[in-house]
Interface confidence: low
């Protein structure tokens, strides 16, 4: 049915001609994401008609129809003026039950309603800066915690649980006082953690799930962003000891996920987003991925258990086949190994015998080839000066921040992007701080030594000399054609 | 029957691997000396990488030394201001309040008369009242239509710090200033076993003997480029723009004879500078024939593959190319705060409407 | 840019089958999630079926579940949807689309496509 008939039964305000247009519109557009410019106005109009009867009260018998039909226009870039109201995105959030002003209400909300009622403030949300600012104003974030906090003693359904995370995401990612709000006054991470917590269905001690299933990952997923939303710029700050348990008890869970897969082609999503978290973790909690007790089939090395550390170099291997996206799918998982390296000599060990083990093949330039390392050493000279200096950084740290050793693994050249940023270049300290860290040279490596160019990082014959046969005067003319190109070049 | 070796055949052998050891540790000594060249054009972040060593290799400098810095920071400050005023009158621009003028006057006085490494008061009310001029901001806009030195703000902004009677300057503002340099400044280094000879070429022409020396056996070259020079406008003097200025003298140690085996790391240098002006001025400025979008990435990419692609011998030859900003020397607790915006935008971006 | 040039469109009696290509050009095609999509002249369009980057993982419409099938040949920078059982309501013009975005959230919910070819008509004729 066409927007403008559906304007013309509103107009005329018969209750079953209403009902059976907006059922057909809603029937037609279900999936329509995408408008024609023809009827922009005849939309509009529907959209005026539908938010003025919201404003007074939609009849409890056809809320739904009615909140489909706001949901399939609230799409429609050109109608947002019209819901994006301080009225309309109270009714909204009446209907949503999370409206601050209103008691609760006394009989359970019909969910049907709650949940098409939180669908369309997810669109507005979305993409309205005016209703952004007004659901901040509306202080909409406040009943949304409280529900998320009841999920544990009441059950609601998974899509109002997921539809009430995905706007607390929306309204943390584009509002950063609602972050604010979140993170401080309302407890949000304690909140969030208890959440994540109870939609894994685990507690800490246990062994992880094997495989999520795809309604826990979506919602787990959910959780995870808004506590990245609310860490990222709250917990570079020192944390006293009651927040720091309380983080490393988020960092148990999150080692879970990392350990976890999800249903579905899911996993690998499920754990970006836990790696995006972890890398907002205080570094003092970051020791919790190798608390891990050791245990039947774990992974380990120097007493401590791996697997997590494990897990999370497979997801580096994983991200660096992709050559979109690069920053934010290498950059967080490289920052997180890098701090537990530099913090935990197990693990620094055991990532340096995975990605820098004793050099053998010295014939072959350190950035070719299908290798972690080759692929990382090829990222110390990518475009992103970010993904450039994270890789560079691991790296370095592996070598136990020894300049020497950096460029023995990656070459002079490819190492001169860091050691320029770090103020390197001539060697800094001696060596790293990490004096008993010993470094194994294979037979193989002593044997090429003498011939391998520092600068290129491989084997190299001595190549003739170009100015060979020429006499000094010779050799004067052609020193002096490039000094004059130099004169030139710094004047 | 077993092969057993008397006791004199056995020292023997000892002998002879202690020969050859001794012989492989000559070579090893020779081969791992590492011979470096140093260049780039005045304005390219080429000291930067010198002063920087200078920073951290040898504990940074000491007070005295940077109290010594504190006659070239006032000179470049001065410059830089008297720069921006000189360049209003070629660029038709009015002072904000025409109350600067006097203030424009008096600065040439008082610049004239200041004694070397000291900044009087007056003359620091002069320059701050001038900076804060909208006229002279407008300018100061469009240095890339003039010579101003790329510090320029830093020091203006600092004025305050910087005019204090008890003032010394700090390891950045080091970083930050400008002297011309000249001649070859050599600089050794030692990474454990590797030995370092690095020389700073800078325009002078000294005994050629000692330029010969300099050029013969070069492991690599490290060519500094100023990515934000794409933009400036030709001095009357000059026949082309910086930055073909520099692909042609790439091109030329590139492909020269004397360098046919030797690396090349190319600094493409103040990527920050460049990122903020790619949004305003666009890169056909400088290659009229660029087709791609003034994004950071796409326009960084073209000017690499610009100078890589002047490299004559690619199978045999390698260009190690780095994006820096010179004059960050913050040794960064590393977290990805870079990334973290990103994040939170590809997280919006993949939510999808209902 | 991704350019997409659609193929194999035609007439059909119901029942039979038609396999429509679609192949990219400029950028390489395989870091894209790729889809189908039909519009019936006057309507809005239509989601068919999307595959994701390495086509480990494709979605469908209900309409069109168990008749067609989405797959792509990265090698070869195609995609392709195999219809078969075709009934005269799948008469439309068929567009091949690409998208960056992830291909969950096209299970999701409805993303708009960034890329989309100019279109191949499919008439099937009871």
């Known amino acids: 049915m066409e927007p403008r008939a559906v304007a013309d039964a509103l107009e005329t305000g018969e209750e079953d001609a209403v009902t059976e247009a907006l059922r057909s519109f809603n029937r037609e557009h279900s999936q329509s994401f995408t408008f024609d410019d023809a009827q922009q106005e005849d939309r509009k109009r529907l959209a005026k008609l539908l938010v003025s009867v919201l404003e007074q009260g939609l009849s409890p018998k056809h809320r739904v129809t009615w909140l489909q039909t706001i949901r399939i226009l609230s799409r429609d870039r050109s109608c947002l003026d019209s819901f994006a109201s301080r009225q309309s995105l109270h009714a909204l959030a009446c209907y949503a039950d999370i409206a601050i002003s209103e008691e609760p209400i006394p009989q359970p909300p019909d969910m049907d309603v709650l949940l098409e009622s939180l669908k369309c403030l997810c669109n507005l949300v979305l993409s309205s800066p005016t209703a952004q600012m007004l659901a901040a104003e509306a202080r909409l974030v406040v009943r949304l915690a409280e529900r998320v906090g009841l999920y544990r003693k009441r059950s609601y359904p998974h899509e109002v649980q997921f539809f009430d995370l995905r706007l607390l995401f929306l309204l943390t990612a584009l509002r950063t006082d609602v972050r604010q709000q979140l993170f401080q006054e309302l407890h949000g991470v304690r909140l969030l953690t208890d959440a994540l917590e109870l939609t894994l269905g685990v507690a800490p001690k246990e062994n992880p799930l094997v495989i999520l299933p795809a309604q826990e990952t979506e919602r787990a997923m959910e959780i995870l962003k808004v506590l990245f939303n609310i860490t990222y710029d709250s917990v570079k700050r020192e944390v006293d000891e009651e927040d720091a348990a309380l983080y490393r008890y988020l960092g148990t869970l999150l080692r879970h996920c990392v350990m976890a897969d999800a249903a579905g082609d899911r996993t690998e999503e499920f754990h970006g987003h836990t790696v995006n978290l972890l890398g907002n973790l205080p570094l003092k909690c970051l020791d919790v991925l190798l608390a891990l007790e050791l245990h039947e089939g774990s992974l380990e090395f120097m007493g401590v258990n791996m697997d997590v550390i494990n897990a999370l170099l497979a997801f580096l291997e994983k991200r660096l086949h992709q050559t979109h996206r690069l920053k934010e799918c290498v950059a967080p998982v490289l920052s997180v190994l890098t701090e537990c390296a530099r913090m935990h000599r197990p693990a620094r060990k055991f990532l340096k015998a995975q990605v820098l083990p004793p050099l053998r093949d010295v014939r072959t330039r350190p950035e070719v080839g299908d290798l972690l390392r080759n692929k990382l050493v090829r990222l110390m000279t990518h475009l992103d000066t970010d993904v450039k200096r994270v890789a560079a950084e691991f790296l370095f740290v592996l070598c136990s921040e020894s300049v020497p050793r950096f460029i023995k693994y990656t070459g002079y050249g490819n190492a001169a992007g860091l050691l320029a940023a770090r103020g390197l270049m001539a060697g800094g300290r001696p060596e790293g701080q990490y004096s008993e860290d010993e470094d194994t040279d294979t037979e193989e490596y002593r044997e090429a030594k003498a011939s391998i160019n520092p600068v290129t990082g491989r084997v190299e014959e001595k190549p003739p000399n170009p100015m060979e046969g020429m006499t000094e005067e010779q050799k004067e003319h052609e020193a002096m054609k490039l000094v004059n190109m130099f004169d030139k070049l710094s004047r | 029957m077993g092969c057993t070796l008397s006791a004199e055949d056995k020292a023997a052998v000892e002998r002879s691997k202690m020969i050859d050891r001794n012989l492989r540790e000559d070579g090893e000594k020779a081969a791992r000396e590492v011979k470096l060249l140093l260049l780039g054009a005045g304005e390219s972040g080429k000291s930067t990488i010198v002063k920087q060593m200078k920073i951290i290799h040898e504990a940074g400098y000491s007070e005295e030394e940077c109290k010594q810095y504190k006659a070239v920071v006032y000179s470049n400050t001065i410059q830089s201001i008297i720069a921006i005023i000189r360049a209003m009158g070629r660029l038709k621009i009015d002072f904000g309040d025409a109350a600067r003028a006097d203030d424009a006057r008096q600065l040439f006085v008082l610049a004239g008369a200041a004694e070397e490494g000291f900044m009087t008061a007056e003359l620091a009310g002069v320059i701050k009242r001038l900076w804060k001029d909208s006229g002279v901001q407008a300018c100061f806009n469009r240095s890339r239509e003039y010579q101003l030195n790329d510090s320029a703000a830093y020091y203006l902004n600092d004025l305050d710090r910087i005019a204090q009677p008890n003032y010394i300057p700090t390891q950045q503002d080091v970083l930050r200033t400008r002297v011309k340099t000249t001649g070859i400044v050599e600089t050794h280094f030692t990474f454990k076993d590797l030995h370092f000879k690095m020389f700073d070429v800078g325009g002078q022409r000294s005994e050629r003997k000692k330029w010969i020396h300099c050029f013969e056996g070069v492991t690599a070259i490290i060519f500094c480029v100023a990515l934000s020079d794409y933009d400036l406008v030709l001095a009357e003097d000059e026949e082309m723009n910086r930055m073909h200025e520099s692909m042609k003298l790439f091109d030329s140690i590139c492909n020269n004879k004397w360098f046919t085996d030797t690396s090349i790391i190319l600094f493409l240098n103040k990527k920050d500078l460049f990122e903020e002006k790619i949004k305003k001025s666009p890169l056909t400025i400088c290659y009229p024939e660029y087709a791609g979008s003034n994004t950071y990435e796409e326009a960084a990419a073209y000017i690499q593959c610009q100078f890589e692609d002047l490299n004559k011998r690619k199978d045999t030859k390698e260009i190690y190319t780095h994006f820096t900003c010179a004059t960050d020397t913050k040794n960064v607790q590393f977290v990805f705060d870079a990334v973290t915006d990103v994040i939170i935008k590809n997280n919006l971006k993949d939510c999808g409407l209902f | 840019q991704v350019q997409l040039v659609e193929s194999g469109g035609g007439l059909v009696q119901a029942g039979g089958s038609l396999r429509l290509s679609c192949e990219a050009s400029?950028?390489?095609?395989?870091?894209?999630?790729m889809g189908w999509f039909r519009r019936v002249s006057g309507k809005e369009r239509e989601f068919v079926a999307a595959?994701?980057?390495?086509?480990?993982?494709?979605y469908y419409a209900d309409s069109v579940k168990g008749r067609f099938t989405i797959s792509r040949d990265n090698s070869k920078n195609t995609v392709y949807v195999q219809m078969n059982g075709l009934k005269p309501e799948d008469t439309a013009v068929y567009y091949c689309?690409?998208?960056?975005?992830?291909?969950?959230?096209?299970?999701?919910?409805?993303?708009?496509?960034?890329?989309w070819g100019q279109g191949t008509q499919v008439t099937v004729s009871s």
């Open positions: 400029g950028r390489t095609s395989s870091s894209y999630v």
């Open positions: 595959i994701n980057p390495t086509g480990s993982s494709t």
């Open positions: 689309a690409a998208t960056r975005r992830d291909f969950y959230i096209i299970r999701n919910s409805r993303p708009q496509f960034d890329y």
